[in-house]
Amino acid sequence: RKAVLDCEAMKTNEFPSPCLDSKTKVVMKGQNVSMFCSHKNKSLQITYSLFRRKTHLGTQDGKGEPAIFNLSITEAHESGPYKCKAQVTSCSKYSRDFSFTIVDPVTSPVLNIMVIQTETDRHITLHCLSVNGSLPINYTFFENHVAISPAISKYDREPAEFNLTKKNPGEEEEYRCEAKNRLPNYATYSHPVTMPSTGGDSCPFCLK
């Protein structure tokens, strides 16, 4: 009789579909992730099963707490889709599909500087390119550790460009750029390039 009651409950909102989620949705290969399969009903003893496409990854029992499945994303096919099943006696419901986005981390970008020197000004063009990493890549340019550009999004493998005009400075300035894609908390910086102060023939990047 209990099984019948559980199955009847399934047909109402008392036993809705489970929820499958992960704190990390954008991952890189080799990353460990935790997937949480949870259910609104906190009083029932529930058996949770995790699937990826058409393979079974594991089963856990839980009551009141979500089931936690720990995985390592090492191959492209491991992005998903995943789904979890909540089962009580002979009755079950499935979650919606969940997929990770696998992103290759950006490598350190290379900063190139081109300068056109006039008597009063320096017209500076900064180019920044990261040759590896999943697109799109956001580039930001810095002068003396202060951002001087907005984030420039590049959807193809070409350098980001930023132009600025400066009065001929009296002291040297340091430029660098940052490359960042969808991987959270993962940004790389170029080596700094120092622009010498004016005075004498001290503009190695200048177009004469």
């Epitope: 099963s49 699937f51 393979t55 990854l57 594991g58 079950s92």
Partner: antibody, heavy 119, light 112 residues
């Protein structure tokens, strides 16, 4: 070349044991699932059990307890340990590989090895 | 236990005929489409023809097609060729009582 080669079949007495091997080449068992299937003479195909890329094992109801599937990643080989063998276990035993993340879409098969249980 | 029943168990046909084989499962397969079809010739290992109930496996001629969902599935050969005389099996994947697979009973296609 991707292939599976079974070995270890032969004549065994009722009540005896036998271990079949399935040597995989051209791919890694840490990515693919291997399934054992058997076919008695003149009969249909019968699923025995499966070991997936995570090492999880699954068995047919009738095979549970008597048959055990294991693998050795260093040798890229899967094993089928068969105990308490009976005359009705006489069959050709196949191992087969599934698609990635699809345990039972069996697209690569071994040639099969014959097991005869008789006194 | 899950039952996978194929019908007919055998059939005779001519080259050029349209042939239909059905597979009836006692329970719904996982995802409603975890079903594949295999061809086996005497003394040989089976060969995958169809997966996901209706998707053609690599290298399989387009005269083979599959359909169905849940518990009822069909394999169709639109125009039977001499090399198609063989035995055909369906294979379902299930998660109702553990992660489980079951073959159909088989259908032997012979020359009329």
């Amino acid at each position: 070349e991707v292939q599976l080669v079974e070995s270890g079949g032969g004549l065994v007495q009722p009540g005896g044991s036998l271990r079949l091997s399935c040597a995989a080449s051209g791919f890694s068992l840490t990515i693919y699932t291997i399934t054992w299937v058997r076919q008695a003479p003149g009969k249909g195909l019968e699923w025995i059990g499966t070991i997936n890329s995570y090492g999880n094992t699954y068995y047919s109801t009738w095979a549970k307890g008597r048959f055990t599937i294991s693998r050795d990643n260093s040798k890229n080989t899967v094993y089928l340990q068969m105990n308490s063998l009976r005359a009705e276990d006489t069959a050709v035993y196949y191992c087969a590989r599934g698609y990635v993340d699809s345990d039972w879409y069996l697209n690569i098969w071994g040639q099969g090895t014959l097991v005869t249980v008789s006194s | 236990a899950i039952q996978m029943t194929q019908s007919p168990s055998s059939l005779s046909a001519r080259v050029g005929d349209r042939v239909t084989i059905t597979c009836q499962s006692s329970e719904s397969v996982y995802d409603n489409n975890y079903l594949s079809w295999y061809q086996q010739k005497p003394g040989k290992a089976p060969k995958l023809l169809i997966y996901d109930a209706s998707r053609l496996a690599s290298g399989v001629p387009s005269r083979f097609s599959g359909s169905g969902s849940g518990t009822q599935f069909t394999l169709t050969i639109s125009s039977l060729q001499p090399e198609d005389f063989a035995t055909y099996y369906c294979l379902g994947g299930y998660d109702s009582s553990g992660w489980y697979a079951a073959f159909g009973t088989g259908t032997k296609v012979t020359v009329l």
